[in-house]
């Protein structure tokens, strides 16, 4: 299959990602032409038929114009002007802009709690077989058996830290080589970027906004991806990064230094305590092969407990079994020895939901999944409207000039790399990669933050996590200071050549047009953003694994040609973008091959099937909805149906479908004002500022 | 109290055999070790060997073992130290002392057994 | 076998008296150690063990120290009961043995 189905060069060309008549939304539909018009007043569309839909959004109206998609889109204030308020004006639109604020921070607080309570869903469901990846003996020699275990644990963690922590104490505990561990860290460097791609999801229901933020989600994915790819081979021949660090930390006289400080977590953390605690050290326990850690639940139970150290009087078969020959002696029959046996006791048990329901792991793991993306979904939607409707007119305009602008010639080079120390900055104070890129995927999504501005401060989270890792590994006891600290060294250094590699040079930034590409693609199918999801971070990953397992002549067997395949169809590609002439005339496009080998199109068939099942039970259950609240408070007009339903309606009443603007998702309220149904009074109480 | 009664003075011929008993009372029989101590006239104390009622277990000092056997009744709560083959060198005190658990010391002894041994 | 010197053999001493017994095993035992008080004719009474630890019922005149291979008895105010002959014994390893015994004299 060719790499980018359907897509010809990089260049954002916008002709060549329409299908049919429905072509790409433009990226910046004009609120304020859309306020007050009615579903008969419509300016003109082309009427086409409906085509099978691409997600669950609906199309949207045919541009006049075609733009570039990825130009940010113009947010144009409807409000009044502060200059034209009156005093009650001005205060209520003080007060509207307070409280703005406040909501903002309240979903941004309850966005980032899902986050953590997510990565507790994904550790109760998958966190003691992420444990046992780690039991897997062929680590030590099989560097790429490392890479995808270190992308499958953090993948099921939803924690690069908590399989660096579990790789460290392998480590120090002399169960892994630090030569072993660095393809684990390389790879859980990969699986940390899961995170954002998924809240990318989240923003599904406007395609141009989803364009953005799935590409400014995947760049992450396609830098770490990129730098493994070049990075690893490069280790695995030359072992710079295991000789960088190891001569670092035999140079320097470490002394245990304090822990990282726990900004963003303070914060947090008395919420998503109430929600669930885990007892981290189960998966940790289980990955160095304690038997007893596999029957242990990640559930923490009691939060107060009296560790007791006492000495007890042991029997021993002989006297070669004792502590020491001082510590030894006989009863007369047995031999006894002295051992130090620590007692706990149990004294208060945790204050969360789920502590006296005993439930299975798998059953709490689950329950909090779909709670915690639906906490997440919920919250993004919120962020993206309050967002939606402070940055308009002059706040979006200043807010963007100080994002995407670059300094002043000569100086313009310098902007990104103040970019990339801004997100190491912004990491190293919530503490999380993951929580920083999650925030910045809505920014990229509505526009806020352009894809080119978005990469820098990606590569500076990447850096400012290993910052916050270097820091926890100084305040590591004794034992495990030289090997944490060498391995957020190694992660470091990864990190930084990663940078060296896919930055300074704008040529080198492949990740931002490949993830362009993809942002292209899943915009217009949506569902092969949930295909690579999927593809990349669980199918490769787990049939690497497989394979290893199998052996290396097995792995070699089946890696090579596929291998083969894709330098091939890489270099045919290059090619025919560059120099066609070269090539022969059926080799100058992809049209020798069937069409589902090099087209989305039948595949999309396949999954509109589906998918369209899914949809129409979906749609009656919305309209039954509907009726009846309709029926209850006595007004024909009180809700609608979603979109999507009203057009599944009239494709089956056989009828044109002019294809509407992108209200799809949207809170009715908000859509029924867009289409004038609502008062235009509610509308004029906007503020244009905070 | 924890009380040992050990069973009377005996005589006996050289070669012959004699078992002397050392029935326990105020503690649980079964889970402290029971030794045999002898002290010959005008000498030291000697360990002859221990066994544990609760399972029957013994060990014996070497240079008695084969004329000495330890055995225990947990129904009597009583134990018993068989001395054989007995030479005029065997003459002594055989004392019956209750070990402390968890280790060798001996806290209550009992009043001593004289085994005289002669033709 | 680990052999246990005890020294003096024969000590005489005064009431009111300090007295030190001295214990050397022939190697480390730790503090598998106790000390026992035999009168003449009666059964052996503990009185130290661990070493250092008072058996319940000896009074606090009586104390000892030492691990590894060198104990003492200390008796640190001779009363007209104490006179008797001094065991020591070491568990800390089979068989069993006791010193030769010191004899506490009225002087």
């Known amino acids: 299959m060719a790499p980018w189905p359907e897509l010809g060069d990089a260049q954002p060309n916008p002709d060549k990602y329409l299908e049919g008549a429905a072509g790409q939304q433009p990226t910046a539909p004009d609120k304020s032409k859309e306020t007050n018009k009615t579903d008969n007043t419509e300016a003109p569309v082309t009427k086409i038929e409906l085509l099978p839909s691409y997600s669950t959004a609906t199309l949207i109206d045919e541009p006049t114009e075609v733009d570039d998609p990825w130009n940010l889109p113009t947010l144009q204030d409807s409000g009044i002007k502060w200059s034209e308020r009156d005093t009650k004006g001005k205060i209520l639109c003080f007060f509207q802009g307070i409280g703005r604020l406040i909501l903002l921070l309240g979903f941004l607080y309850f966005f980032v709690c899902s986050l953590d309570i997510l990565s507790s869903a994904f550790q109760l469901v998958g966190g003691k077989m992420a444990g046992q990846f780690f039991s897997n003996s062929s680590i030590m020699s099989n560097p790429l058996l490392g890479l995808v275990i270190g992308v499958l644990v953090t993948v099921l963690v939803q924690s690069s830290s908590t399989s660096t922590s579990i790789v460290v104490s392998m480590v120090s505990s002399s169960l892994l080589t630090v030569r072993a561990a660095i393809p684990i860290i390389m790879g859980a460097n990969i699986g940390t970027s899961i995170t954002n791609t998924i809240v990318a999801l989240m923003q599904v229901g406007d395609r141009s906004e989803f364009r953005r933020a799935f590409a400014g989600a995947t760049v992450h994915d396609f830098f770490n991806w990129l730098s493994v790819l070049v990075l690893l081979p490069v280790e695995v021949a030359t072992h710079y990064l295991e000789i960088i660090t190891q001569l670092i930390v035999e140079s320097f006289h470490f002394k245990n230094g304090e822990d990282a400080p726990d900004l963003l977590k303070v914060i947090t953390k008395p919420f998503t305590k109430l929600i669930v605690q885990l007892d981290k050290k189960v998966i940790s326990q289980i990955a160095m092969n304690d038997e007893k850690a596999k029957n242990k639940s990640l559930v923490k139970i009691w939060c107060k407990t009296f560790t007791n150290k006492t000495q007890i009087n042991v029997t021993v078969p002989s006297t070669a079994n004792c502590t020491s020959p001082s510590l030894c002696w006989t009863d007369g029959i047995q031999n006894w020895t002295m051992k130090n046996v620590t007692y706990k006791e149990n004294i208060a048990k945790c204050q969360h939901i789920f502590v006296n329901f005993h439930l299975p792991d798998l059953a709490v793991g689950t329950i909090l999944l779909i709670l915690s993306l639906l906490v997440l979904c919920g919250c993004l939607i919120m962020i993206v409207k309050i967002l939606g409707s402070v940055l308009k007119g002059q706040v979006a305009t200043v807010i963007k000039k100080t994002i995407n602008t670059d300094f002043p010639f000569p100086f313009a080079w310098l902007t990104g790399y103040l970019a990339i120390l801004v997100g190491a900055g912004m990491t190293f104070i919530v503490q999380s990669s993951s929580v920083f890129t999650s925030a910045l995927t809505p920014l990229i999504g509505i526009g806020v933050i352009t894809i080119e501005r978005a990469y820098p401060l990606t590569l500076g989270s990447n850096i400012g996590t290993t910052t916050t890792a270097i820091l926890a590994a100084l305040a590591s006891p004794g034992n495990a200071l030289r090997s944490s600290l060498q391995i957020a060294l190694c992660h470091f250094f990864f990190n930084i050549s990663g940078i060296l590699l896919w930055y300074p040079i704008p040529f080198t930034r492949l990740p931002i047009r490949m993830a362009k590409g993809l942002g292209n693609i899943s915009a217009k199918y949506r569902w092969f953003a949930v295909f690579y999801l999927i593809i990349f971070f669980f199918l490769i990953p787990l049939t690497v694994f497989g394979l290893s397992l199998a052996g290396w002549r097995v792995l070699v067997g089946v890696g090579v040609p596929v291998v083969f395949i894709i330098i091939l169809v890489l270099c045919l590609r290059l090619l025919q973008s560059r120099c066609p002439r070269v090539l022969p005339k059926k080799l100058q496009n992809w049209n020798f091959l069937p069409l589902w080998m090099r087209s989305l199109k039948p595949w999309d068939a396949v999954v509109s099937k589906f998918t369209g099942c899914f949809q129409m039970r979906c749609c009656c259950c919305c309209r039954v909805c509907c009726r009846a609240c309709c029926l209850l408070c006595d007004c024909p007009k009180c809700c609608r149906c979603s979109k999507c339903c009203e057009d599944l309606e009239e494709a089956q009443e056989g009828q044109d479908v002019p294809v509407k603007a992108p209200e799809t998702f949207d809170n009715i309220t908000i859509s029924r004002e867009a289409q004038g149904e609502v008062p235009a009074s509610d509308s004029k109480t906007e503020c244009t500022a905070l | 109290q924890v009380q040992l009664v050990q069973s009377g003075a005996e005589v006996v011929k050289p070669g012959a055999s004699v078992k002397v008993s050392c029935k326990t009372s105020?503690?649980?029989?079964?889970?402290?070790?029971m030794h045999w101590v002898r002290q010959a006239p005008g000498q030291g104390l000697e360990w002859i060997g221990a066994?544990?009622?609760?399972?029957?277990?013994?060990a014996y000092n070497q240079k008695f073992k084969g004329r000495v056997t330890l055995t225990a009744d947990k129904s009597t709560s009583t134990a018993y130290m068989e001395l054989s083959s007995l030479r005029s060198e065997a003459t002594a005190v055989y004392y019956c002392a209750r070990g402390m658990y968890g280790h060798g010391a001996m806290d209550y002894w009992g009043q001593g057994t004289l085994v005289t041994v002669s033709s | 076998d680990i052999q246990l010197t005890q020294s003096p053999s024969f000590l005489s001493a005064s009431v009111g008296d300090r007295v030190t017994i001295t214990c050397k095993a022939s190697q480390d035992v730790g503090t598998a150690v106790a000390w026992y008080q035999q009168k003449p004719g009666k059964a052996p009474k503990l009185l130290i063990y661990?070493?250092?630890t008072r058996h319940s019922g000896v009074p606090s005149r009586f104390s000892g120290s030492g691990s590894g291979t060198e104990f003492t008895l200390t008796i640190s105010s001779l009363q007209p009961e104490d006179f008797a002959t001094y065991y020591c014994?070491?568990?800390?390893?089979?068989?069993?043995?006791f010193g030769q015994g010191t004899k506490l004299e009225i002087k």
């Open positions: 105020g503690y649980t029989f079964t889970t402290n070790n």
């Open positions: 661990w070493a250092t």
């Open positions: 014994q070491q568990y800390s390893s089979n068989p069993l043995t």
């Open positions: 066994i544990y009622p609760g399972s029957g277990a013994t």
